[in-house]
Every structure is written in structure tokens, then in C-alpha cells.
């Protein structure tokens, strides 16, 4: 006869490990007992359990409640056991010793491998601002056994660097993603992808990039100066900019207070029916936590009685 077992048994943390030990005997041969022991500890073998043909399963105190026989139906030549709820410390070498009649004793050895799936974490780097050089966008760390693979999935151009820390029974892998921030990256996904044999599918953690910036400001509404004449209704100036975080707008008049009746509505300055007192230099002030911008325009309200048009100056300042 001979023993059938596996060289390696692989389970995921928390699963039950079946340790196989089947005696393939000739007809009439019987298995009297099967002793299971862990044998990679330097100070001696550690008994798991003893399966006795007459007296059943006897689990050692060290493995109380953790070793069972596989569910019925059971073959009397099958000395396999289940190690319940495998933990990382169970990883190691095991042997079964089978006492048979009349063929004598046989033994087999196997390695139990316990996969510890990683629980990845993604940490965003410092705030990204347009104009910075190469900056850490995010780091992703995953610890497991064996060491997990950590990669990045993104449309954003950048560079990655990885480092690994070995612990007694696991390894932690950290990957960093660096980039040169630009406004085009804003809102783009940066996904950390963790692969591991203990995972049914890759784990993905997505971080949305936020790049602080503030675009140059400009004012729209004076494209056709001839429309700015006394009595016109619905005249308005709109301040154009964009930024992250979204900017706030403030309107002032450089050569005095805003005329009465002029309405400020965020980025828009609304005028009542135009009069000459609305002529002047208007400043749009755009700001966010990152920066501020100004744009000023000169409004010259025309008197329709006059023939000659007047030049309009558009000045933009940062």
C-alpha cells in the first residue's frame, strides 16, 4: 500500500484546511490509527489529533475545537482531517503517520500554506496645486501573505515607485503615484489595483484627483459697444473664470461705488436701464483658496444723439 496526500495544501485565512492522508491499501488491509502532527517547530512535533479505528478522533489540547474529520460518508482508510478556521500561524509542515495491519506504518508530509488576503488602503498625498513640480498624488498600501501586487490604473500621466516591508509572516507593499499637477487632471480617477492569490478578483480603490487652480479672469458683455447706450435695458457684464475649488466673484467699481440699481449676482453684474452715470471702470475680482485674479473693463454708455462712437479699453490684470 501507499499513502496519498498533497505536497502543498493552500487555504485562505479563515477557511477550513483539509489535510489529506489516504491509505491506498491492498484488499484486506486495515488502518488502525492515524496520528497527525505539526513538525516544523524546532522544539519537537506538536500533535494535532489521533484518529483511532476503534475509539474515534482524539484532538490534542493544543488544537481543541479546531480539528475535525471530514463529513460522512467516511472511508476507513481515509485519515484526512479538517483544520478549522486556518490562521496565519497554522502555516507550516504537517505529517500523518498511519499504522496499518498487516503492512505496518507509513508516513507522509505536507505543507500548509495560509493565504492572507490584503486589506488595501489608499492615502491621498498633499493638496495638488497647478504649478507644482513632481508631487505625490496618492500612496496605496496592502499587507498580505504572500506579498500582494500593487499597481495603478489611470489615464493620468505619472510615475510610480514601490517598496516592500517583510514581516515575520507577511509582507506590506506600498506604491506611490507621483505626477506634475495640471488642471486637466482635475476630476480624473486614480485607481489602486491590488492583486493577490487569496483574492477572487483584484481589489480596486479609486481616488478622484483634485488639482487646485484658478484660470485668468475675463469679462464678457462688451463685445458690441454700440449696444451700451442710454435707455438700454437688460445690459449685463459676466465675469469668466474657472477654478478648483470653484471660485467666488466680487464686483467693484474702480472710480467709485457701484451705481444704485446695479445688481450683483455672483459672476454677473446686472444693470438697470442705462444712464451716463453707469459709465466707469468695473473690476471683477475672482478668488479661491488657491489664488485670486482681477479683470477690469471700462464701460462708456453712449448717448444716441451723439454720432461718434467711443473706444472701449479692455484690461486684464493678475
Amino acid at each position: 500500500g501507499e499513502l496519498e496526500t498533497s505536497d502543498v495544501v493552500t487555504v485562505v485565512l479563515g477557511q477550513d484546511a483539509k489535510l489529506p492522508c489516504f491509505y491506498r491499501g491492498d484488499s484486506g488491509e486495515q488502518v488502525g490509527q492515524v496520528a497527525w502532527a505539526r513538525v516544523d517547530a524546532g522544539e519537537g512535533a506538536q500533535e494535532l489529533a489521533l484518529l483511532h479505528s476503534k475509539y474515534g478522533l482524539h484532538v490534542s489540547p493544543a488544537y481543541e475545537g479546531r480539528v475535525e474529520q471530514p463529513p460522512p460518508p467516511r472511508n476507513p482508510l481515509d485519515g484526512s482531517v479538517l483544520l478549522r478556521n486556518a490562521v496565519q500561524a497554522d502555516e507550516g509542515e504537517y505529517e500523518c503517520r498511519v499504522s496499518t495491519f498487516p503492512a505496518g506504518s507509513f508516513q507522509a508530509r505536507l505543507r500548509l500554506r495560509v493565504l492572507v488576503p490584503p486589506l488595501p488602503s489608499l492615502n491621498p498625498g498633499p493638496a495638488l496645486e497647478e504649478g507644482q513640480g513632481l508631487t505625490l498624488a496618492a500612496s496605496c498600501t496592502a499587507e498580505g501573505s504572500p506579498a500582494p501586487s500593487v499597481t495603478w490604473d489611470t489615464e493620468v500621466k505619472g510615475t510610480t515607485s514601490s517598496r516592500s516591508f517583510k514581516h515575520s509572516r507577511s509582507a506590506a507593499v506600498t506604491s506611490e503615484f507621483h505626477l506634475v499637477p495640471s488642471r486637466s487632471m482635475n476630476g480624473q480617477p486614480l485607481t489602486c489595483v491590488v492583486s493577490h492569490p487569496g483574492l477572487l478578483q483584484d481589489q480596486r480603490i479609486t481616488h478622484i484627483l483634485h488639482v487646485s487652480f484658478l484660470a485668468e479672469a475675463s469679462v464678457r458683455g462688451l463685445e458690441d459697444q454700440n449696444l451700451w447706450h442710454i435707455g438700454r435695458e437688460g445690459a449685463m457684464l459676466k465675469c469668466l473664470s474657472e477654478g478648483q475649488p470653484p471660485p467666488s466673484y466680487n464686483w467693484t467699481r474702480l472710480d467709485g461705488p457701484l451705481p444704485s440699481g446695479v445688481r450683483v449676482d455672483g459672476d454677473t453684474l446686472g444693470f438697470p436701464p442705462l444712464t451716463t452715470e453707469h459709465s466707469g471702470i468695473y473690476v471683477c475680482h475672482v478668488s479661491n483658496e488657491f489664488s485670486s485674479r482681477d479683470s477690469q473693463v471700462t464701460v462708456d454708455v453712449l448717448d444716441p444723439q451723439e454720432d461718434s462712437g467711443k473706444q472701449v479699453d479692455l484690461v486684464s490684470a493678475s
Epitope: H52, H58, P61, E64, E95, R97, S99
Partner: antibody, heavy 117, light 111 residues
């Protein structure tokens, strides 16, 4: 310090029973098998059986099945061996021993049982 | 059951000389990992004391003059140099399977 303290010598009549105790101290009682060994006068050592202090599960040498009954009292960290239907062949020194990874690293001092009319 | 045969049953060795005790098992008690054979010393009126476990591993506190060797079925306990205090009976024991058994013992006398 691991200690196994056995009960004192016993003189019993043939056909009677005797219960020997083995009180463990200096370690977690439920973490190790307790074995019992017989040594007849001038003779060698015979393994009687073992008990798992966690649950009281026992395994016996077939020769002593029905003769010896092994039990434990977890609350007092004490193992017991009862010997039944005693005959002169049962006169011997009986030892309890704690198993450490398949070897008997700690032994009680022994209990002499004398069966005599 | 596995039968352990010890020889000699008794021996007398001069102080400082070598004592050699043999133990033969009726079947192998070794795997690729461990040999399930142990040696005990018993002095009169005392319980046995573990000397060597797994055929060759000296138990903590035991003098290095005690040396165990062997695997499979043939095992040897050597004591060299013997000292007066080594007067005792020595037993081999296997823990390969149930029932565990002991050898018949070897009584060592120091001349």
C-alpha cells in the same frame, strides 16, 4: 515551576477499587495531555493511557481497558485514575506524567498501591 | 503494538568509561521530520526523568555526556564519561502510536 503532586500510598483489599489523584500546578492544566504509567515492583514501565483535561477524552492501552478509568477535575487542576476489581497483579507504583510534544517531561512522585487481603 | 527490546539488561562500567545501551524497535518510529523515541533515567525511589527526546535531543539541564543516536528501528544511548551519579535504570520509549511502550530497562552500575 511545574509540579505534579500525587496522593499517598494505598493498601486495598482484593476486589476493591482505589482512586489515585494527581494535582497539577505551575502551568495551564488544560493545555497538556496527562498520562498514567504503571511500574510493578522490580519491573519495567507500562503505559496505561492518557486523558485530555479539556474534555475528559481518554485513550487507553487495550491491556488496561476496563481496569483503569481516567478522569479530570478542571476546577482543581487534578487528574484521577480509578483502578477497579483489584488483584495482586495491580500492586505497583503508579505515576502521572505530563506530555510535552510527545515526551513525558514532568512526572508525579508516584503512588504505591498494595493489594492485599 | 510496537515492542522495544533493550540490551543489555544490566551492565557495570568503570568510572570515567563509556556506557552504551541499545534499544531496538519492532518497526520504524522515524519520519523525515522526527524520530519518536525518547530516553529516561530512573533512580531508586524516584520517578523516571526525561534525558533525551526525539532520539538525540538533550533535554534541558541534562549533562552533555548523555548522547542519543539512531533512527528507524535501532537506537543507542551513550554515557561518557560515566559518573557515580549515573547509577540508575535507563528506559527507551516510543510515542509513534497508541499504545506508547517502554523498553524493559537497562540497569547501569558504576564500578
Amino acid at each position: 515551576e511545574v509540579q505534579l503532586q500525587q496522593s499517598g500510598p494505598d493498601l486495598v483489599k482484593p476486589g476493591a477499587s482505589v482512586k489515585i489523584s494527581c494535582k497539577a500546578s505551575g502551568y495551564s492544566f488544560t493545555d497538556y495531555y496527562m498520562h498514567w504509567v504503571k511500574q510493578s515492583r522490580g519491573k519495567g514501565l507500562e503505559w496505561i493511557g492518557r486523558v485530555n483535561p479539556n474534555n475528559g477524552n481518554t485513550l487507553y492501552n487495550q491491556k488496561f481497558r476496563g481496569k483503569a478509568i481516567l478522569t479530570v477535575d478542571k476546577s482543581s487542576s487534578t487528574a484521577y485514575m480509578e483502578l477497579r476489581s483489584l488483584t495482586s497483579d495491580d500492586s505497583a507504583v503508579y505515576y502521572c506524567a505530563r506530555e510535552d510534544r510527545y515526551a513525558f517531561a514532568y512526572w508525579g512522585q508516584g503512588t504505591l498501591v498494595t493489594v492485599s487481603a | 503494538d510496537i515492542v522495544l527490546t533493550q540490551s543489555p539488561a544490566s551492565l557495570a562500567v568503570s568510572l570515567g568509561q563509556r556506557a552504551t545501551i541499545s534499544c531496538r524497535a519492532s518497526q520504524s518510529v522515524s519520519t523525515s521530520s522526527y524520530t519518536y523515541m525518547h530516553w529516561y533515567q530512573q533512580k531508586p525511589g524516584q520517578p523516571p526523568k526525561l534525558l533525551i527526546k526525539y532520539a538525540s535531543n538533550l533535554e534541558s539541564g541534562v549533562p552533555a555526556r548523555f548522547i542519543g543516536s539512531g533512527s528507524g528501528t535501532d537506537f543507542t544511548l551513550n554515557i561518557h564519561p560515566v559518573e557515580e551519579e549515573d547509577t540508575a535504570t535507563y528506559y527507551c520509549q516510543h510515542t509513534w502510536e497508541i499504545p506508547y511502550t517502554f523498553g524493559g530497562g537497562t540497569k547501569l552500575e558504576i564500578k
